[in-house]
């Protein structure tokens, strides 16, 4: 299964269009920047097998699309960029179901990283949070749509090492 | 390793163009926002304004608004300053730093080594 | 604009004190708020970010506290390589605004 490989380039077209996907300036957001406290060890231990990274990142990809397919977002971004951005997450999470039933197969170790997938859970209840509080405003999302273009380019690292170890 | 390289120093007249550069290597350059600060001889640091590389988006202050231009070139990882028209009070060091938008990371942790513009008749 | 102002604009110190230098905004900017060192001839140097977490490298008698607009650097022991000149700097609102300075001098 080449998932590393079709994965990144459906994580670059993703990041293409939520860079496009952007309505006011951020300029005027400066003092809505928030600390959401990304994950990063659960995408830098190299102890995961293949099965384990792969449902971290579908995790991080369904929570991703979840928060986009709210009727608040709906509400707030062009709605022709935002069904192709989540056409895209959706491709990418059906790549990665097949890709883990492959693997299944092939490892002994479990399938899911429970604590991984639960820091990630965390990590986007936090971020629902931000929104909520903030009611929703325009500057709200761009501060999240800056964080997840940011926690997107972090997970495309992990999935470079990903492939470097195949 | 992060860095940003500006261009050397310039010599200019009065009522001259100039265009300076700053040019971004060791990190995504359009996942950061460039900004451009000035220091006059013997002065403190005065911010002049910014650029979003990804879309080239600009913010400026208002004391340097129409005085100055700031642009990007994303293909090349640079971004400049330009004047089209240089007074004798353009005279100063000027500084590119990088900034991290609305990523909640540090504010200008890398800067540019500075780019001295004498104008001068 | 938000102005921000130091104090004070100067100071003499020896070697082994402690150092403190304020910065006040003349508005709430909650903790958006960094402290840079520039020596003579150079870019200025990040020491502090979101008024006080200390930037990777800088050693850690350096610290910042304060929010809204009392903010405060402290250098614990001063060393022979901190006499330079600081500057605060609110990252609140555009236009961002830096502080007029404080210049640290061997007593």
């Known amino acids: 299964c080449d998932l590393p490989q079709t994965h990144s380039l459906g994580n670059r077209r993703a990041l293409i269009l939520l860079a496009q996907m952007g309505r006011i300036s951020p300029f005027s957001c400066l003092k809505d920047r928030h600390d959401f406290g990304f994950p990063q060890e659960e995408f830098d231990g190299n102890q995961f097998q293949k099965a384990q990274a792969i449902s971290v990142l579908h995790e991080m990809i369904q929570q991703t699309f979840n928060l986009f397919s709210t009727k608040d977002s709906s509400a707030t971004w062009e709605q022709s960029l935002l069904e192709k951005f989540s056409t895209e997450l959706n491709q990418q999470l059906n790549d990665m179901e097949a890709c883990v039933i492959q693997e299944v197969g092939v490892e002994e170790t479990p399938l899911m990283n429970v604590d991984s997938i639960l820091a990630v859970k965390k990590y986007f209840q936090r971020i629902t949070l931000y929104l909520t509080e903030k009611k929703y405003s325009p500057c709200a999302w761009e501060v999240v749509r800056a964080e997840i273009m940011r926690s997107f380019s972090l997970s495309k690292i992990f999935q470079e090492r990903l492939r470097r170890k195949e | 390793e992060v860095q940003l390289v500006q261009s050397g120093a310039e010599v200019k007249k009065p009522g001259e163009s100039l265009k300076i550069s700053c040019k971004g290597s060791?990190?995504?350059?359009?996942?950061?926002?460039i900004g451009w600060v000035r220091q006059m001889p013997g002065k403190g640091l005065e911010w002049m304004g910014i650029i979003d590389p990804s879309d080239s988006d600009t913010a400026y202050s208002p004391s340097f608004q129409g005085q100055v231009t700031i642009s990007a070139d994303k293909s090349i990882s640079t971004a400049y300053l330009q004047w089209s028209s240089l007074k004798a009070s353009d005279t100063a060091m000027y500084y590119c730093?990088?900034?991290?938008?609305?990523?909640?990371?540090?504010?200008?942790?890398?800067w540019g080594q500075g780019t001295l513009v004498t104008v001068s008749s | 604009d938000i102005q921000m102002t130091q104090s004070p604009s100067s100071l003499s110190a020896s070697v082994g004190d402690r150092v403190t230098i304020t910065c006040r905004a003349s508005q709430s900017i909650d903790d958006f708020l960094n402290w840079y060192q520039q020596k003579p001839g150079k870019a200025p140097k990040l020491l502090i970010y979101f008024a006080s977490s200390l930037q990777s490298g800088v050693p850690s008698r350096f610290s910042g506290s304060g929010s809204g607009t009392d903010f405060t650097l402290t250098i614990s022991s001063l060393q022979p390589e901190d006499f330079a000149t600081y500057y605060c700097?609110?990252?609140?609102?555009?236009?961002?605004?830096f502080g007029q300075g404080t210049k640290v001098e061997i007593k």
């Open positions: 060791g990190y995504s350059f359009t996942s950061y926002w």
């Open positions: 730093a990088r900034h991290p938008g609305l990523n909640w990371a540090p504010d200008f942790d890398y």
């Open positions: 700097q609110q990252s609140h609102t555009l236009p961002l605004t």
